[in-house]
């Protein structure tokens, strides 16, 4: 066959669908690879062809669109399963071609089994809710296009394994689940099961997402440097190891980049000749507030090093702060222990 622009296996789109549920999969060519849409391609005389490679096989084969009840069908740029079976797992290819043009891309499709509590190997999207922030909602994801607007599906919401039946703080209303006051106790997996009729059959769509309650923007503050501070003096003799921790608290802020860095005499440690090492550790609270610690270490400090300025800096979307460490050279203790002892009449 003639040359075809092959975009390879698009592993970025690792599509996972539940067994025995409808699935509609759009050809990724029009979404991510080509500059035109299916309608334009179709009106230009291009044809979309689908084929697949079964799991653990190398042989590409056409998709059987003549299965009972049209279990697999194609509609425009969408491949439909009504419903999926476990052995539909494999790599699927959509190819757009005519006599002079050809472009194709493959993508992996994994049909996943779930248990009665909706546990499965499915990768779950995470939805962050602000703690005690006001009425917040999650929406049953990825159900558009499965049924026309004239069809009114029934939607049942679950937290973990259990149907939500206590509406004091969490209220299901159709595709939405509202949290009246989000609390840590609301953390967990939430599942919506959408049931709809089609051609005398009943289909179910199961969608699970993870809710994580995080710090509220109304409580967010600029970074707080706990260490160094004015109460601790780093007093060292030349030759000793100097260890200065910089410990910074960052409020949770959606999409904020938290940064901590040291300067020595106004320069980054990389830009000076001292043998400095910096080790960083990060911990998170239950609401994803962050504490970063950067320990500045000089193995054998010199008297010159003890005269330098060591400043810890921190930055987030809320602002930038800095704090200098109090570093000084230890004054050697006077060696008059013998004289003092004699003075007190010791023998």
């Amino acid at each position: 066959s003639e040359r075809c622009d092959d975009w390879g296996l698009d592993t970025m789109r690792q599509i996972q669908v539940f067994e025995d549920e409808p699935a509609r999969i759009k050809c990724p060519l029009f979404e991510h690879f080509l500059k035109f849409n299916y309608s334009t391609a179709h009106s230009a005389g291009l044809t979309l062809i689908w084929y697949w490679t079964r799991q653990d096989r190398d042989l590409e084969e056409p998709i059987n669109f003549r299965l009972p009840e049209n279990r697999i069908s194609k509609e425009k740029d969408v491949l439909w399963f009504r419903p999926t079976l476990l052995n539909d797992t494999g790599n699927y290819t959509c190819m757009l071609r005519n006599t002079t043009y050809c472009s194709k891309v493959a993508f992996p499709l994994e049909v996943v089994q779930k248990d009665s509590c909706f546990n499965s190997p499915m990768k779950l999207p995470v939805h962050k809710l602000y703690i005690e922030y006001g009425i917040q909602r999650i929406t049953c994801p990825n159900v558009d296009g499965y049924f026309p607007s004239s069809v009114k599906p029934t939607i049942t919401w679950y937290m973990g394994c259990y149907k939500i039946q206590n509406f004091n703080n969490v209220i299901p209303e159709g595709m939405n689940l509202s949290f009246l006051i989000a609390l840590i106790s609301n953390n967990g997996n939430y599942t919506c099961v959408v049931t709809y009729p089609e051609n005398g059959r009943t289909f179910h769509l199961t969608r699970t997402l993870t809710v994580k309650v995080v710090g509220s923007p109304k409580n967010a503050v600029p970074p707080v440097i706990h260490s160094p501070n004015d109460h601790v003096v780093y007093e060292k003799e030349p030759g000793e190891e100097l260890l200065i921790p910089c410990t910074v608290y960052f409020s949770f802020l959606m999409d904020s980049r938290n940064e901590v860095w040291w300067t020595i005499d106004g320069k980054k440690p990389d830009d000076i000749t001292i043998d400095v090492t910096i080790n960083e550790s990060i911990s998170h609270s239950r609401t994803e507030d962050e504490t970063r610690t950067q320990i500045l270490s000089i193995k054998k400090v010199t008297s010159e090093d003890l005269k330098r300025s060591y400043v810890c800096h921190a930055r987030s979307a809320k602002g930038e702060v800095a704090k200098a460490a109090k570093v000084k050279q230890k004054v050697p203790a006077p060696r008059y222990t013998v004289e003092l002892a004699c003075g007190f009449g010791a023998t």
Epitope: G134, I135, Q165, N166, F167, N168, N169, I171, E173, S178, L180
Partner: antibody
Framework: QIQLVQSGPELKKPGETVNISCKAS????????MHWVKQAPGKGLQWMGW????????TYADDFEARFAFSLATSANTAYLKINNLKNEDTATYFC?????????WGQGTTLTVSS | DIVLTQSPATLSVTPGDSVSLSCRAS??????LHWYQQKSHESPRLLIK???QSISGIPSRFSGSGSGTDFTLRINSVETEDFRMYFC?????????FGAGTKLEVK
């Protein structure tokens, strides 16, 4: 069928205390939060706050934080509104209402008159 | 706080007329708006939820529309028992707020 039945009208003097009850029936009381709404004579509706019927935790609107208290007798499927140190401006009809993001069931209202 | 402004404050109509009541929010509230009817000395009654969803037991002449900040309650062919107060309420965020109401009266 679902019903919210409130206690009868009250006539009080300024400085006194009143307790208004709201008894629920026809559904699981602890499954829905209970809200309180004030309506002064000839005026509109003013949301006062709510009580979580599962935990007993109350939440008050800003204007109702000082002298107002929501409470429960869960075993009796009853919510209470207590108003301390009554003032003339407390004269109003008070409604309890079951909440499902909208108020789907209301009590019949309790009329409180505060007058010296 | 989200302020709901209802207009007009009073609407005078003849039975059989069709009317539209307006409720405007001070900020977008998606479709988190509900309509109530209240007869004097009675408790409010839910008419429409989520801007346009009908409530069982409510006559079909009542319908709602709108999203974001502008909402409308429409009564097709007003009947005598419809001459009451109408309130809108938002559940988009705390504190929950009501509009000041529209009084529907006989012309």
């Amino acid at each position: 069928q679902i019903q919210l039945v409130q206690s009868g009208p009250e006539l009080k003097k300024p400085g006194e205390t009143v307790n208004i009850s709201c008894k629920a029936s026809g559904y699981t009381f602890t499954d829905f939060s209970m809200h309180w709404v004030k309506q002064a004579p000839g005026k509109g509706l003013q949301w006062m706050g709510w009580i979580n019927t599962e935990t007993g935790e109350p939440t008050y609107a800003d204007d109702f934080e000082a002298r107002f208290a929501f409470s429960l007798a869960t075993s009796a499927n009853t919510a209470y509104l207590k108003i301390n140190n009554l003032k003339n401006e407390d004269t109003a009809t008070y409604f309890c209402a079951r909440f499902f993001l909208h108020f789907d069931y209301w009590g019949q209202g309790t009329t409180l008159t505060v007058s010296s | 706080d989200i302020v709901l402004t209802q207009s007009p404050a009073t609407l005078s109509v003849t039975p059989g007329d069709s009317v539209s009541l307006s409720c405007r929010a001070s900020q977008s509230i998606n479709n988190d708006l509900h309509w109530y009817q209240q007869k004097s000395h009675e408790s409010p009654r839910l008419l429409i939820k989520y801007a346009s969803q009908s409530i069982s037991g409510i006559p079909s002449r009542f319908s709602g529309s709108g999203s974001g900040t502008d909402f409308t309650l429409r009564i097709n062919s007003v009947e005598t028992e419809d001459f009451r107060m109408y309130f809108c309420q938002q559940s988009n965020n705390w504190p929950l707020t009501f509009g000041a109401g529209t009084k529907l009266e006989v012309k």
